[in-house]
């Protein structure tokens, strides 16, 4: 059974990813990034179920791609280089859906873009934060 | 028909620079990145780096970093690329490209047709 | 960066035989929410621009003969060659086209016995 301190744990990694999907959602919707039509062409992958921690596989999948496409954006529109910021979103997410069970992730049919994606997954942080509080 | 014109061959001398450039026809090259590929016989085929045609922003391979400067101008549909401090290692083909489609980034379908830089003192 | 191992250097072969030219990644090419490898076969031939002939690992490009065959999944991929035409006779190269710097493998030099 988890406790309070690994729970607490969780929310906070939880919370710090939730941050950094945001920023990043932020950036791209700058209305100074010209880049934004352009981003939005490029597909992205979505869980056919996000309602655990171990689904965190299924964005685990999609960093790499999430990472060539923010090259494709001034890198003002961000604090971090997107190299920085997928790898610090990276080891979260690997903390968060531990390593122990291998989870085949099942994808949607549907493709998305990375708006979508990103408020996807922004949607999934904040509902299993609020299980945890 | 999509193609890439580029210019013709250059003979420069060492630690001079070079100018080449890449005319697009057949679409508008603010839809798609242009990209820049080395050629020499003895290795192959080398990614230099790309530019977005609509603002200018580029992305280098690390080796190419300060050897290479993309730029692009959309009044003429085409791009360009400077290579500074030329030395005999610089003698190469050097190809312009662009991508299959508007999906992702890679790979590249349409080729210019290269041109030679001759590096000589 | 993601390297790639190409393999043979050099390839001798006779019109109508068969032949595959092998490449290896250094890191899975395989993006799961696609099923797709992204990796990309070329034919150079002196003096012109490399053609695109694969894509996406196994997918023809537009106009490329059927004998061209690209298969392979993650790390290990191959090109296959049937019936060996003399226009085939060509530089070979893989390109990683997943992760910024795309990377090319050395390359494979098809020779006529």
């Known amino acids: 059974a988890p406790t309070s301190s690994s729970t607490k744990k969780t929310q906070l990694q939880l919370e710090h990813l939730l941050l950094d999907l945001q920023m990043i959602l932020n950036g791209i919707n700058n209305y100074k990034n010209p880049k934004l039509t352009r981003m939005l062409t490029f597909k992205f992958y979505m869980p056919k179920k996000a309602t655990e921690l171990k689904h965190l596989q299924c964005l685990e999948e999609e960093l790499k791609p999430l990472e060539e496409v923010l090259n494709l954006a001034q890198s003002k529109n961000f604090h971090l280089r997107p190299r920085d910021l997928i790898s610090n979103i990276n080891v979260i997410v690997l903390e968060l859906k531990g390593s122990e069970t291998t989870f085949m992730c099942e994808y949607a049919d549907e493709t998305a873009t990375i708006v979508e994606f990103l408020n996807r997954w922004i949607t999934f942080c904040q509902s299993i934060i609020s299980t945890l509080t | 028909e999509i193609q890439l014109q580029q210019s013709g061959p250059e003979l420069r001398r060492p630690g001079s620079s070079v100018k080449l450039s890449c005319k697009a026809s057949?679409?508008?090259?603010?839809?798609?990145?242009i990209h820049w590929v080395r050629h020499r016989p003895e290795h192959g085929l080398e990614w230099i780096g790309w530019?977005?045609?609509?603002?200018?922003?580029?992305r280098y391979a690390q080796k190419f970093q300060s050897k290479a400067t993309l730029t692009a101008d959309t009044s003429s549909n085409a791009a360009y690329m400077q290579l500074s401090s030329l030395t005999p290692e610089d003698t190469a083909t050097y190809f312009c490209?662009?991508?299959?489609?508007?999906?992702?980034?890679?790979?590249?379908?349409?080729w210019g047709q290269g041109t030679l830089v001759t590096v000589s003192s | 960066d993601i390297v790639m191992t190409q393999s043979p250097f050099s390839l001798a072969v006779s019109e109508g035989e068969m032949v595959t030219i092998n490449c290896k990644s250094s890191?899975?090419?395989?993006?799961?929410?696609?099923?797709?490898?992204?990796l990309a076969w070329y034919q150079q031939k002196p003096g012109q621009s490399p053609k695109l002939l694969i894509y996406?690992?196994?997918t023809g490009q537009s106009g490329v003969p059927d004998r061209f065959i690209g298969s392979g999944s993650g790390t290990d991929f191959t090109l296959t060659i049937s019936d060996v035409q003399a226009e085939d006779l060509a530089d070979y190269y893989c390109?990683?086209?997943?992760?910024?710097?795309?990377?090319f493998g050395a390359g494979t030099k098809l020779e006529l016995k």
């Open positions: 490209a662009r991508s299959l489609d508007s999906t992702w980034i890679y790979p590249f379908a349409y």
């Open positions: 057949g679409y508008n090259i603010t839809d798609y990145l």
């Open positions: 530019i977005d045609p609509e603002d200018g922003e580029t």
């Open positions: 890191q899975s090419l395989l993006r799961s929410g696609n099923q797709k490898n992204y």
């Open positions: 996406y690992a196994s």
């Open positions: 390109l990683q086209h997943y992760i910024t710097p795309p990377t």
